[in-house]
Interface confidence: medium
């Protein structure tokens, strides 16, 4: 059942479609209680009882995680894949998603990216787009499929609030971020605006309403002078490096 789906409450997830299937067909009414989708077993997880989030692809993990089998050789033999911590600079990698934000995989090593302000996933997305492989466009997710680069060239850039598949679908100053069980173009964050800090553990609510990343020259940090009894409810804002 959906209730048994484990949720890493920090990572932005591509949630399973309602009812666990491929999503409703156009015109159908999917009125499953929305809370079921994100009230998994570890919604109120603590550092002590952290449970890894099972995944099928990197997109399902947080910005500083990637999807892989926890033990070598298990993948492809029915082994469960989970979200693992990203690899830092100069660590070995097999693909871009394995490297931490601001890095990319070159010759099997995580190297610093020239575009360190880009969100993690932008590089992979451009590669996926060129291959015409929209593997993350799940039916029922509420956004159109595009399977060729050609169709992208003639596609009007999405405005704020417009449904998208990836950030390159959106106009300048916008990124493609989850909103409900879809993705829409949202503004890249400016200085002082609330941002989401993705950690491996802790945090309180699943971000089914994903924010964009902070703009160039900004980092998502805990708001100074924001003294909170509970760490989980502290606000993070985009601040100058």
């Amino acid at each position: 059942t959906l209730n048994s789906v484990l949720i890493n409450s920090n990572a932005i997830k591509n949630l399973p479609p309602p009812l666990g299937g491929a999503g409703g067909q156009p015109g159908s009414a999917v009125s499953v209680a929305p809370g079921v989708l994100y009230e998994g077993g570890n919604k109120y997880q603590t550092l002590d009882n952290y449970q890894p989030y099972p995944c099928a692809e990197d997109e399902e993990c947080g910005s500083d995680e990637y999807c892989s089998s926890p033990s070598r050789g298990a993948a492809g033999v029915g082994g469960v894949q989970i979200c693992l911590a990203c690899r830092k600079r100069r660590k070995r990698c097999m693909r871009h998603a394995m490297c931490c934000p601001g890095n990319y995989c070159k010759n099997g090593i995580c190297m610093p990216s020239d575009h360190s302000h880009f969100p993690r996933g932008e590089i992979e997305e451009s590669i996926i787009e060129n291959l015409g492989n929209d593997h993350n466009a799940a039916a029922g997710d509420g956004y159109p499929r595009r399977t060729t680069l050609t169709s992208k060239i003639y596609h009007t850039k999405g405005q704020e609030g417009s449904v998208c598949l990836r950030s390159s679908d959106c106009a300048a100053g916008l990124c493609c971020a989850r909103h409900f069980w879809s993705k829409i173009c949202k503004p890249v964050l400016k200085e002082g605006q609330v941002c989401t800090k993705h950690k491996r553990k802790g945090s309180h609510g699943l971000e089914i309403f994903q924010r964009c990343y902070c703009g160039e020259g900004l980092a998502c940090r805990i708001q100074k002078d924001h003294h909170q009894a509970s760490n989980s409810s502290r606000l993070h804002t985009c601040q100058r490096h």
């Epitope: 479609p17 309602p18 999503g23 409703g24 067909q25 156009p26 015109g27 159908s28 009414a29 999917v30 009125s31 209680a33 929305p34 809370g35 994100y38 009230e39 919604k43 039916a139 029922g140 997710d141 509420g142 956004y143 159109p144 009007t156 999405g158 405005q159 704020e160 609030g161 417009s162 449904v163 909103h179 409900f180 069980w181 879809s182 829409i184 949202k186 503004p187 002082g192 605006q193 609330v194 989401t196 309180h204 609510g205 971000e207 089914i208 309403f209 924010r211 409810s233 606000l235």
Partner: antibody, heavy 116, light 112 residues
């Protein structure tokens, strides 16, 4: 500019049905989630339902689940709300709202009165 | 059911600053940093003033600002003007069956 115009409201008896429409213009209707929000006379706002851009997902408030159906026709740039088994407590101004970054654009509303 | 609690009324004089609070629970406002504020003048449709706690849509005056601490969000209006007199509603997302929750609304009166 973005424009949303509701229609179809009126007086209906308890147990009756009504279909509201919302004509959208000034934006790419087929690219946006849309919602219905209502406001009883002298009361606050209450979210009713939301539909995804391609109609594949619809969600409802508990108070209307099983009685109301949200739908859309992207070729006509129109959002609908079919309301069945109406009750006195459904009396309200019904607004259609574009659900972009939250409810970023609203129509002027249409009044639905359920009374015998 | 009103999920978020707001004061029924708030008042202030022109030029002053006022703050409207909105209190929820860890299942809604406290659990998500997604709070929006709407302004509604009598007989008119609501207008989005703040989203994502403290973001202003284009065209909204910078006199309007939002913040959040724990389970409580706040809307602050500085340099109060006569045209600010209206009803203000907070809105958040929630777990459970109701996806979108509103506050009961606060009537802002600008004195004088």
């Amino acid at each position: 500019q973005v424009q949303l115009v509701e229609s179809g409201g009126g007086l209906v008896q308890p147990g009756g049905s009504l279909r509201l429409s919302c004509a959208a213009s000034g934006f790419t209707f087929s690219s946006y989630w849309m919602s219905w929000v209502r406001q009883a006379p002298g009361k606050g706002l209450e979210w009713v339902s939301v539909i995804s851009s391609d109609s594949s997902s619809t969600y409802y408030a508990d108070s209307v689940k099983g009685r109301f159906t949200i739908s859309r026709d992207n070729s006509k740039n129109t959002l609908y709300l079919q309301m069945n088994s109406l009750r006195a407590e459904d009396t309200a101004v019904y607004y259609c709202a574009r659900h972009g970054i939250d409810f970023d654009h609203w129509g002027q509303g249409t009044l639905v009165t359920v009374s015998s | 059911d009103i999920a978020l609690t707001q004061p029924a009324s708030v008042s202030g004089s022109p030029g002053q600053s006022i703050t409207i609070s909105c209190t929820g629970t860890s299942s809604d406002l406290g659990g998500y940093n997604y709070v929006s504020w709407y302004q509604q003048h009598p007989g008119k449709a609501p207008k989005l003033m703040i989203y994502d706690v403290n973001n202003r849509p284009s065209g909204v005056s910078n006199r309007f600002s939002g913040s959040k601490s724990g389970n409580t969000a706040s809307l602050t209006i500085s340099g109060l003007q006569a045209e600010d007199e209206a009803d203000y509603y907070c809105q958040s997302y929630a777990s459970g069956n109701t996806k979108v929750v509103f506050g009961g609304g606060t009537k802002l009166t600008v004195l004088g």
